[in-house]
Every structure is written in structure tokens, then in C-alpha cells.
């Protein structure tokens, strides 16, 4: 029987800068029941606080609700693992909520084949930002990426759309059924999951010349 091994806070994510959750990985348990507590203070403060919510994020997590989340302030946190034989502490983790946003996928993905008479035909893709993200305040800049492939192909073709919420693709294989998905990323932060796939049948007379 031994003191617990060193835990590690390995991930923090926020859906929208208003709340966030951090997860830790326990060290070895030393063969005894082990209790974990996460403590934190904000940059410039000395007062330590305990995790406000160990439940919402699931096992080995700490959730910070709206009233505990402030932007532009670094949180300095650590996890303490304790059993009957002793304690061990994780390294301190510095967290700025602005940098850990992982939004939901974009919404309302619409795909259409456009065949103007005077110009080349193209695939027109349009989407909306995720609902939790408030783009109007200017706090967020979302970048978008599109991927598409013929249904039976193995490789995805990826296009970076920047901040646009619509995109045109010219080079497609006529007669093929394509899968199209989009994802988004804040200027600082993490890519969302890919949106559910939308299917589009490219007409056989779709010409690229």
C-alpha cells in the first residue's frame, strides 16, 4: 500500500466561453481508496477555491458554471490525490478560457448543384454558425473547413473557407454521389466535430469544361 501516484489535468474545454470543464487522469491508486480534489486560484489572487462542481463533467472532472467562469483571467489549478498513506499533487495547469473553446458543429448545412447558363456549374455549400456562439459581440471569430468525397472514395478533399459561411466548389466528378461536412474553429481554440454528412447527387451532365 502506497500513497497515490501523481494525477494530471490533461484537458479543458468550453463550448462558448461562458462555462468550462477540466478533466484529470488519476495516477496509480496505491492500492487504497483515493479521493481527488481540484483547487484553483485566478491570476493575481492568492485565495484558493475548490472545484464548484465535480458532477456535471463526469468522472475525474471539474465543471465551472457561468458564475465561476471569467474570460481574460488565467486560472491556475491543480489536483490533489489523497489516500490513507499520503497525498500527491498534479503540476499546476494555467487555463485561459478564451483559448479552450470547442464549439458545437455548424448547423443547417445545405448543398446544391448550381448550373448557371453563362458560367461553369458548381457545388454551392452553405451553413450557419452553432447556436451557442455569439458572433455579434465580436468576442468570437469562427473559421470553417469543409470536407467532401464521393460516397465510395476513401480520401476526403478538404477546403478552408476562412470566416465565410458559404463556399463554391467547381471540380467534381459527374454522376457521383458526394458526402459533404463542415466544421468550425474559433481563432484560438479547437475544431468542432464535423457536422452530420449531407449527401448530394452530382448530375451526369455536370461538365467542368
Amino acid at each position: 500500500q502506497l500513497p497515490p501516484g501523481k494525477p494530471e489535468i490533461f484537458k479543458c474545454r468550453s463550448p462558448n466561453k461562458e462555462t468550462f470543464t477540466c478533466w484529470w487522469r488519476p495516477g496509480t491508486d496505491g492500492g487504497l481508496p483515493t479521493n481527488y480534489s481540484l483547487t484553483y486560484h485566478r491570476e493575481g489572487e492568492t485565495l484558493m477555491h475548490e472545484c464548484p462542481d465535480y458532477i456535471t463533467g463526469g468522472p475525474n472532472s471539474c465543471h465551472f458554471g457561468k458564475q465561476y467562469t471569467s474570460m481574460w483571467r488565467t486560472y491556475i489549478m491543480m489536483v490533489n490525490a489523497t489516500n490513507q498513506m499520503g497525498s500527491s499533487f498534479s503540476d499546476e495547469l494555467y487555463v485561459d478560457v478564451t483559448y479552450i473553446v470547442q464549439p458545437d458543429p455548424p448547423l443547417e448545412l445545405a448543398v446544391e448543384v448550381k448550373q448557371p447558363e453563362d458560367r461553369k456549374p458548381y457545388l454551392w455549400i452553405k451553413w450557419s454558425p452553432p447556436t451557442l456562439i455569439d458572433l455579434k459581440t465580436g468576442w468570437f471569430t469562427l473559421l470553417y473547413e469543409i470536407r467532401l468525397k464521393p460516397e465510395k472514395a476513401a480520401e476526403w478533399e478538404i477546403h478552408f473557407a476562412g470566416q465565410q459561411t458559404e463556399f463554391k466548389i467547381l471540380s467534381l466528378h459527374p454522376g457521383q454521389k458526394y458526402l459533404v461536412q463542415v466544421r468550425c474553429k474559433p481563432d484560438h481554440g479547437y475544431w468542432s466535430a464535423w457536422s452530420p454528412a449531407t449527401f448530394i447527387q452530382i448530375p451526369s451532365d455536370f461538365t467542368m469544361n
Epitope: 503540476d91 495547469l93 494555467y94 479547437y190
Partner: antibody, heavy 120, light 107 residues
Framework: EVQLVQSGAEVKKPGSSVKVSCKAS????????MHWVRQAPGQGLEWIGE????????NYNQKFKDRATLTVDKSTSTAYMELSSLRSEDTAVYYC?????????????WGQGTLVTVSS | EIVMTQSPATLSVSPGERATLSCKAS??????VAWYQQKPGQSPRLLIY???NRYTGVPARFSDSGSGTEFTLTISSLQSEDFAVYFC?????????FGGGTKVEIK
């Protein structure tokens, strides 16, 4: 204990490429951005670029955008920096540096440095 | 890009005295400034982040004041291990840039 261990010194000819490695240990590799910084002999520090090991998303200093390529191998917790079209002015110590936290770009852990000498 | 200008290039100080190092940014950077110490043959070591916050394990004799464009690193009472080169760095906008360094040497 967090450690960043870099590959050994390299001597390269002008026009060639060099690939420097940085093996991370003591923490979860995918949690923190990794940066590359260089220091010419007797000079200051110059930021080359950064990479998020979780998804390989990277940002570069425009000065190096066409010549530097940052990659990671998650299976071995190793970051790489390749610099092509080498010239004598690229002679420098190249450092990998780990982001200080989940936040802005200040660097709390540094590799020991890799000296790259470019000479004909 | 934002240019960080450090002065003086060299500072001669006696042990136990106070050292004051200056760093000026060519554009507003808020408090997005870090300070590093580098000794010969070694990698840089982080001292201060967000302009005024000492990193874990950094002695209290190191402090920074300033925001916007002008920053000052103060070492209140120089110890023998403090003689080194000090760099400031801004992380307000890409590309992240460093000052040219100030060498603190024994007087």
C-alpha cells in the same frame, strides 16, 4: 518531470533541408501547443511557428511560412521542425518550447536546443 | 510585426543592488508580455507572464510593472545566479516577437 529532448547538432550545405526532432515526456503531449524558436549565435530569439499536437493545426511566422514545416507524431510524443532551402543565415540554435498552459503563447518548458550549422 | 526594444543592451550591477530592465513595444500589447532569463549555454527560463505574474518557483525578487507599450523588469536585490541575459516577448499578435535582450553583468 516534464522534459523536451531534442535531436543532435547538424551540419548542412546551403540549399539543403534539416529536420529537428523534439521528444516530449512527463505530460500528455496533445494537451499543449508546441512552438519552435531559433537563436543565431550571440543574437536574440526568433519565433518560427507553433503546432497543436491534438490535430496538427499550425501557425507560422510569415518569414518562415514557405520554408518551415511543423509536424507531430502523436504515437511517439515527438514534434518535428523541417527547414528547407537552407542558407548561411539559418545557422542557429533551434529550440522547441512548450506552451505554458491552455492559453496565450508564453513558454514554460524548453528543449536543450539543436545547433544547425549551414556551411559550404 | 510588433518590435520589442530592450534597453540597456548591457547593465552592470553589483550583487545586492537593484536592476531595472526596460522593454518597449512598437504597438499596444496590453499585458501580453513574458520575460525570460538565459544563461550562457542554456535554454531560456520563463520568469514572468501576463506582464506581472511570476511563474511557479520564480523568486519574489523578480517583478514586472507596465502595460500597453512600456514594461519594466525589476530584480530587487541581485543574487549571483541572476547574472544572465533577459528577454521580453509579446504574445499579443502574430508573429510572437522577442526583444534583443539585456545582459546583466557583475559590476
Amino acid at each position: 518531470e516534464v522534459q523536451l529532448v531534442q535531436s543532435g547538432a547538424e551540419v548542412k550545405k546551403p540549399g539543403s533541408s534539416v529536420k529537428v526532432s523534439c521528444k516530449a515526456s512527463g505530460y500528455t503531449f496533445t494537451t499543449y501547443w508546441m512552438h519552435w524558436v531559433r537563436q543565431a549565435p550571440g543574437q536574440g530569439l526568433e519565433w518560427i511557428g507553433e503546432i497543436d499536437p491534438s490535430d496538427s493545426y499550425s501557425n507560422y511566422n510569415q518569414k518562415f511560412k514557405d520554408r518551415a514545416t511543423l509536424t507531430v507524431d502523436k504515437s511517439t510524443s515527438t514534434a518535428y521542425m523541417e527547414l528547407s532551402s537552407l542558407r548561411s543565415e539559418d545557422t542557429a540554435v533551434y529550440y522547441c518550447a512548450r506552451n505554458g498552459g491552455l492559453g496565450p503563447a508564453w513558454f514554460s518548458y524548453w528543449g536543450q536546443g539543436t545547433l544547425v550549422t549551414v556551411s559550404s | 510585426e510588433i518590435v520589442m526594444t530592450q534597453s540597456p543592451a548591457t547593465l552592470s550591477v553589483s550583487p545586492g543592488e537593484r536592476a531595472t530592465l526596460s522593454c518597449k513595444a512598437s504597438q499596444y500589447v496590453g499585458t501580453a508580455v513574458a520575460w525570460y532569463q538565459q544563461k550562457p549555454g542554456q535554454s531560456p527560463r520563463l520568469l514572468i507572464y501576463s506582464a506581472s505574474n511570476r511563474y511557479t518557483g520564480v523568486p519574489a525578487r523578480f517583478s514586472d510593472s507596465g502595460s500597453g507599450t512600456e514594461f519594466t523588469l525589476t530584480i530587487s536585490s541581485l543574487q549571483s545566479e541572476d547574472f544572465a541575459v533577459y528577454f521580453c516577448q509579446q504574445y499579443s499578435s502574430y508573429p510572437w516577437t522577442f526583444g534583443g535582450g539585456t545582459k546583466v553583468e557583475i559590476k
